[in-house]
Interface confidence: low
């Protein structure tokens, strides 16, 4: 009968002819009376056989990722009679994997949005690399993820590629971060290959800034002839947040005379001081009122940033008008 062990050839072998193993008949007594033949796809081009001994060699570099096994046929003939000594037999040469493929991130580019001030542990995004090497062959395709750029704000789970927040970030200081992730095969052992990807992480705004008046004192004037409803001037606060988190409402905090009102222009985010009651220079020629400003929308969990509303003092001078 035929005698052989399982045949394996490592891919990417650089030797001009690599010995794979030996096929032989147990009737072969080693006196060169038998001739071995190789048939099938790759016989004579990729693989050759020593006709006398049955030794098989690979004469080309093989790529497992292109083809992982070859099915060949063997014959053994008695040279003297020309008859087959054994029935023709099929055998397999398996191409064994080497770590010759680096992990690749196939879903690039990565981009994620996460709210500023998110707590540690918040999930940002998962990046996934794939490796063309054989997952069943040692650790050639077992990947470990690590963070090359992005500390101390981000961390990556080594086995899943899940990126999490590891330190609170303030959008008003920096609104986006480039994180560089490396995937390394061989679970990081020597001989590992790596691939890298960049992740753009943008911070979305949360209402963590209250509006603050630009001035602590505003001076306005009003003519005693001004009718009620007259706009006598504007006041302005600034808010480091953006969008609806920067929308604000102005109101009167103190006006003993109840002569003035403040309305909010929601397009410009200015406060407009309005005359609520007519003024009389001869009766009172100046007023002092206090205004405050608050954000329009403040979720309950962010109230801690908005405890004390910003206030400003407005001095209003009444201008005299000649009366008939």
């Amino acid at each position: 009968g035929w005698v052989w062990n399982q045949f394996f050839v490592p891919e990417e072998m650089n030797t001009t002819s690599h010995h794979i193993g030996q096929l032989r008949s147990d009737l072969d007594n080693g006196n060169n009376s038998f001739q071995y033949k190789l048939l099938g796809a790759g016989a004579g081009s990729t693989f050759i056989i020593d006709e006398r001994t049955g030794d098989i060699y690979a004469i080309q570099k093989l790529d497992r990722e292109e083809r992982s096994l070859y099915i060949l046929r063997a014959q053994v003939i008695d040279i003297a009679t020309g008859r087959a000594v054994e029935p023709e037999s099929e055998f397999v040469i398996k191409v064994s994997d080497i770590n010759d493929n680096e992990p690749k991130f196939l879903d690039e580019p990565y981009e994620a949005i996460v709210p500023e001030m998110s707590p540690e542990g918040t999930l940002v995004i998962q990046v996934t690399a794939s490796d063309a090497d054989d997952p069943s062959s040692g650790n050639n395709a077992r990947l470990l993820y690590s963070l090359l750029q992005g500390q101390p704000y981000f961390s990556v789970e080594p086995t899943t590629g899940v990126i999490r927040i590891s330190s609170k970030m303030d959008r008003e200081l920096q609104d986006e971060y480039w994180v560089i992730i490396q995937a390394k095969d061989m679970i990081g052992q020597p001989g590992a290959l790596s691939g890298t990807t960049s992740v753009l992480i943008k911070l979305s705004d949360v209402n963590d800034n209250k509006p603050i008046f630009k001035e602590s004192l505003y001076r306005l004037t009003v003519s005693e002839s001004a009718p009620t409803g007259t706009s006598i001037g504007t006041i302005m606060a600034y808010d480091n947040d953006i969008g609806e988190n920067a929308e604000m409402d102005y109101s009167i905090e103190e006006d003993d005379s109840q002569t003035f009102d403040i309305i909010t222009n929601h397009e410009t985010q200015e406060g407009i001081v309005i005359l609520k009651k007519k003024v009389d220079f001869e009766h009172q020629n100046h007023y002092g009122i206090r205004a405050k400003v608050k954000n329009h929308h403040v979720p309950e969990q962010l109230m801690k940033y908005h405890t004390e509303a910003s206030t400003t003092f407005i001095k209003i001078q009444v201008e005299d008008v000649d009366e008939p």
Epitope: L148, Q149, I180, S194, T196, S198
Partner: antibody, heavy 120, light 110 residues
């Protein structure tokens, strides 16, 4: 903005040594690698070696092995590059360049360069 | 002779697109990030492209980088006279355990 300020120009005789300094400011000195790169007149850039200032770990280009020594002083945020047994072909502008947090991450800031002239 | 191969010169007219290539091997470009530096006459090199295709702040989006296998390229679109400079590719080489630079490409704006 990160700043790397190098020492002034030097004129040396063949066989002598030169020590160039590079003072870093406005970043955490101990977190980043520092490389030295030189450029001979009219030639391209040539990497000489790299040092991590916190541990003093160094990796030198094969060509300069045995002739170059890189050191760091964390108290003054300064790195030094000393080249010995100078020859005329060492005449070049020597740059320090801040690397990344890994050996193989880019150089994002460069010093202004120090001209070293080797002449008898 | 450099480990990374760059053509020594390139040229273009204002507004044109120019590509500068950098060829290496598996141990450098094939397995590490490619970076590009611009060196204007008489000045220190400046980082132009990092991690294959990222631009530092302040670098116009006319500059772009790409990498494929063991080669990388730098593209400059809408060429301007101030782009006249030397351009170098650089990458860490795992076999040499050190940084390698291309020989540099002198870009002339005609």
């Amino acid at each position: 903005q990160v700043q790397l300020v190098q020492s002034g120009a030097e004129v040396k005789k063949p066989g002598a040594s030169v020590k160039v300094s590079c003072k870093a400011s406005r970043y955490t000195f101990t977190s980043y690698y520092m490389s030295w790169v030189r450029q001979a007149p009219g030639q391209g850039l040539e990497w000489m070696g790299i040092i991590h200032p916190s541990g003093g770990d160094t990796t030198y280009a094969q060509k300069f092995q045995g002739r170059v020594t890189m050191t760091g002083d964390t108290s003054t945020s300064t790195v030094y590059m000393e080249l010995s047994s100078l020859r005329s072909e060492d005449t070049a502008v020597y740059y320090c360049a801040r690397g990344g947090i890994k050996l193989w991450l880019h150089f994002d800031y460069w010093g202004q360069g120090t001209l070293v002239t080797v002449s008898s | 002779h450099s480990v990374l191969t760059q053509s020594p010169s390139a040229s273009g007219t204002p507004g044109q697109r120019v590509t500068i290539s950098c060829s290496g091997s598996r141990s450098n470009i094939g397995s590490n990030f490619v970076n590009w530096y611009q060196q204007l006459p008489g000045t220190a090199p400046k980082l132009l492209i990092y991690t294959n295709n990222q631009r530092p702040s302040g670098v116009p989006d006319r500059f772009s980088g790409s990498k494929s296998g063991t080669s990388a390229s730098l593209a400059i679109s809408g060429l301007q006279s101030e782009d006249e400079a030397d351009y170098y590719c650089a990458v860490w080489d795992d076999s040499l355990n050190g940084w390698v630079f291309g020989g540099g490409t002198k870009l002339t704006v005609l």
